[in-house]
């Protein structure tokens, strides 16, 4: 009988130890959750405040309607220009209208004067068709004025108030474009 009682007591003690362990684990887990929660709240707070304070375009970018433009201060070939824009979460400039073309050329006049700037336009080697980088066709009024005599790949660039074409491997400035952030405030 005594043996039976001591066995039950040992079992109860074992149970108690397991429950204490479980409680300890739970407390640890709760603390870790609270820390994670704090981190998440801080992260969200940070994101919200930066979104609240952010202007529609990043620093050193120019805004026009729904777009932001970055005018480069370095030269590069067309393909590297595209990669430089992607790095910034943008693509080479895609001119959708005469109004946009006028804004770009007007801004360039103010900023830098008469230089060459790559845009996201290139000519298909087989068909000779001009296409924007997203695969769409430019509107008839926005085709490069002169056909390049280059045997190499031909890309589009802006100079003064004209859209022209040149060997994609020549070095020029470039213009990147991304969408402006909508203000939700």
């Amino acid at each position: 009988k005594l043996l039976q009682v001591s066995t039950i007591a040992m079992q109860q003690q074992e149970k108690l130890i397991q429950q204490e362990r479980a409680l300890l684990n739970f407390t640890e887990w709760k603390r870790s959750c609270a820390l994670q929660m704090k981190y998440c709240q801080a992260f969200m707070q940070n994101s919200l405040s930066s979104a609240h304070n952010s202007s529609p375009c990043p620093n050193n970018w120019i805004q026009n309607r729904e777009s932001c433009y970055y005018v480069s201060e370095i030269w590069s070939i067309w393909h590297t220009s595209q990669e430089n824009c992607l790095k910034e979460g943008s693509t080479l400039l895609q001119i959708e209208s005469k109004e946009e073309m006028d804004f770009i050329t007007g801004s360039l006049r103010k900023i830098k004067g008469s230089y060459d700037y790559w845009v996201g336009l290139s000519q298909d080697g087989h068909s000779g068709r001009w296409l924007w980088q997203d695969g769409s066709s430019p509107s008839p009024g926005l085709l490069p004025a002169e056909r390049s005599q280059s045997a190499n790949q031909v890309c589009g660039y802006v100079k003064s108030n004209s859209l022209l074409s040149s060997n994609c491997s020549t070095w020029k400035y470039f213009i990147c474009e991304k969408y402006a952030l909508r203000s939700s405030v």
């Epitope: 992607l86 979460g89 693509t91």
Partner: nanobody, 116 residues
Framework: QVQLQESGGGLVETGGSLRLSCAAS????????MGWYRQAPGKQRELVAA???????AYADSAKGRFTISRENARNTLHLQMSSLKAEDTAVYYC??????????WGQGTQVTVSS
């Protein structure tokens, strides 16, 4: 650290189609753009297609009209649907990411072979 794992490569006949996928994992908080490059034997690595965080697209001339890039934001997955494949599309295809710090990460690559 960011890890990129490509899949979907293989052997296909001329005119056939393939869909490449790239799964991104690790500390991906903010991505500026994702894209696909390819490198054929003895040639330089070239950009095939890219998509920015805003959904702006950029394709190489050789990819226009035949390839489509897409992204599943929720699953951090990038796809490249390739159709009307030609022998000259044979290459190792690499997935890439540009993060907010303008750092570029690369996958290990997946081989695409188009037999004529």
């Amino acid at each position: 650290q960011v890890q990129l794992q490509e899949s979907g490569g293989g052997l296909v006949e001329t005119g056939g189609s393939l869909r490449l996928s790239c799964a991104a994992s690790g500390s991906i908080f903010s991505i500026n753009a994702m894209g696909w490059y390819r490198q054929a034997p003895g040639k330089q690595r070239e950009l095939v297609a890219a998509i920015t965080d805003q959904g702006r697209l950029a394709y190489a001339d050789s990819a226009k009209g035949r390839f489509t890039i897409s992204r599943e934001n929720a699953r951090n997955t990038l796809h490249l649907q390739m159709s009307s494949l030609k022998a000259e599309d044979t290459a190792v295809y690499y997935c890439t990411i540009w993060d907010r710090d303008r750092q570029q990460y690369w996958g290990q690559g997946t081989q695409v072979t188009v037999s004529s």
